[in-house]
């Protein structure tokens, strides 16, 4: 993981300021695979190469993000750069075979917190729910909410109940949940981050 991201970044950092501007404009109109959204114009136009790389990877994941970048570069007449990008992403990278993509809903959205991005995976994979509840009690969760989550019979149903309260949370509340996850199931956070 990360090879495609690095290859995208290398390609974008090698563009002139004018070419990067052209790249962004083409990105606004390039045909997208079904189920994938477009990066908002306002955010897109102000980005540098690093931010744009992160946004491409968060919106389209690494494999499709690299493919999309290569398509835009080709469309700009930068065939050699597009070829180098695709070669770099397939060089023993263990990249997913063409046509096999992670579902688009797992891609990050701008301004979407880590716990919102990975809601489904967290519901399915968090096992240490009681520990999370104790960490959040009094800071983020009321006594009533704490008891409601604890009353659920299984870990997934506990997490689903916990997530039923998150729409009312602000960013810092979500950060406290993330901190608790880092402390109790660090390997899971790492794994989700790599995805």
């Amino acid at each position: 993981m990360g090879r495609a991201r690095d290859a995208i970044l290398d390609a974008l950092e090698n563009l002139t300021a004018e070419e990067l501007k052209k790249f962004k404009l083409k990105l606004l109109s390039v045909p997208l695979r079904e189920g994938y959204g477009r990066i908002p114009r306002g955010a897109l136009l102000s980005m540098d190469a690093l931010d744009l790389t992160d946004k491409l990877v968060s919106f389209y994941l690494e494999t499709y993000g690299a493919e999309l970048t290569a398509n835009v570069l080709r469309d700009m007449g930068l065939q050699e750069m597009a070829g180098q990008l695709q070669a770099a992403t397939h060089q023993g990278s263990g990249a997913a075979p063409a046509g096999i993509q992670a579902p688009p809903q797992s891609a990050a959205k701008p301004g979407l917190h880590f716990i919102d991005q990975h809601r489904a995976a967290l519901i399915a994979r968090v096992t240490n729910v009681e520990w999370l509840l104790d960490a959040l009690y009094g800071k983020v969760l009321t006594d009533e909410q704490y008891q409601a989550v604890r009353a659920e019979p299984t870990n997934p149903s506990k997490m689903r109940k916990l997530f039923s309260f998150t729409p009312a949370w602000n960013w810092t509340c979500k950060d406290l949940l993330l901190q608790a996850l880092r402390e109790s199931q660090s390997y899971l956070v790492e794994d989700l981050e790599r995805s």
């Epitope: 908002p40 306002g42 955010a43 102000s46 980005m47 540098d48 690093l50 931010d51 992160d54 968060s58 990050a108 701008p110 301004g111 979407l112 917190h113 880590f114 991005q117 602000n170 960013w171 810092t172 509340c173 950060d175 406290l176 993330l178 901190q179 996850l181 880092r182 402390e183 660090s186 956070v189 790492e190 989700l192 981050e193």
Partner: antibody, heavy 122, light 107 residues
Framework: QVQLVQSGAEVKKPGSSVKVSCKIS????????IHWVRQAPGQGLEWMGY????????MYNEKFQGRVTITADKSTSTAYMELSSLRSEDTAVYYC???????????????WGQGTLVTVSS | EIVLTQSPATLSLSPGERATLSCHAS??????LSWYQQKPGQAPRLLIY???NLHTGIPARFSGSGSGTDFTLTISSLEPEDFAVYYC?????????FGQGTKLEIK
């Protein structure tokens, strides 16, 4: 490119307040957290807290709780850090910083302002 | 709060030598550690994040390793511009904290 430009140096009296600004450009202001870190002369770095301009929520280092207030003005893409009840030990360079990205599971500071020296002296 | 202790406080080496800087956390922080370089009158500069990931634009002579409570920043062959103060920072829990720094000076 991403830029964080801070306000100029300040000299303040003990007991007063200081408000330092950090003007952001080069990315969508509401998408990323902005943190404040200070450094006393010849000393190490100390995290003060952050704001998420998207919803205006802030988190503070408890050491400064009640004395520090971090705010953001979306209309000007500017973050502010106000420190009250100043004492001589608050003399430091105050930095605003932006993480590599905020939607990941951590905060590593890839972008920094140039720093603002605040001197507290009677 | 999590306390990060860096050692040594000062490291005196010559260009071309290998530098090894340590950072010890008071409790388990898994891999949530970064390293910064700071030169006089400048803001810190991110070198390594998540223990071992090299930040964009940082030369490959810098590398990071470790997990749990013990971490290392290695500079394989020192260049004149590498002499500076280095800080570690934990991202595991709030408040975020930094080590007290290691000053890397020319011998």
């Amino acid at each position: 490119q991403v830029q964080l430009v801070q306000s100029g140096a300040e000299v303040k009296k003990p007991g007063s307040s200081v408000k330092v600004s950090c003007k952001i450009s080069g990315y969508s202001f509401t998408d990323q957290t902005i943190h404040w870190v200070r450094q006393a002369p010849g000393q190490g770095l100390e995290w003060m807290g952050y704001i998420y301009p998207g919803d205006g929520s802030a988190m503070y280092n408890e050491k400064f709780q009640g004395r520090v207030t971090i705010t953001a003005d979306k209309s000007t893409s500017t973050a502010y850090m106000e420190l009250s009840s100043l004492r001589s030990e608050d003399t430091a360079v105050y930095y605003c910083a932006r993480p590599l990205y905020s939607y990941a599971s951590y905060y590593w500071f890839a972008y920094w302002g140039q720093g603002t020296l605040v001197t507290v002296s009677s | 709060e999590i306390v990060l202790t860096q050692s040594p406080a000062t490291l005196s080496l010559s260009p071309g030598e290998r530098a090894t800087l340590s950072c010890h956390a008071s409790q388990n922080i898994n891999v949530w550690l970064s390293w910064y370089q700071q030169k006089p009158g400048q803001a810190p500069r991110l070198l390594i994040y998540k223990s071992s990931n090299l930040h964009t634009g940082i030369p490959a002579r810098f590398s990071g390793s470790g997990s749990g409570t013990d971490f290392t920043l290695t500079i394989s062959s020192l260049e004149p511009e590498d002499f500076a103060v280095y800080y570690c920072q934990q991202g595991q829990s709030y408040p975020l904290t930094f080590g007290q720094g290691t000053k890397l000076e020319i011998k």
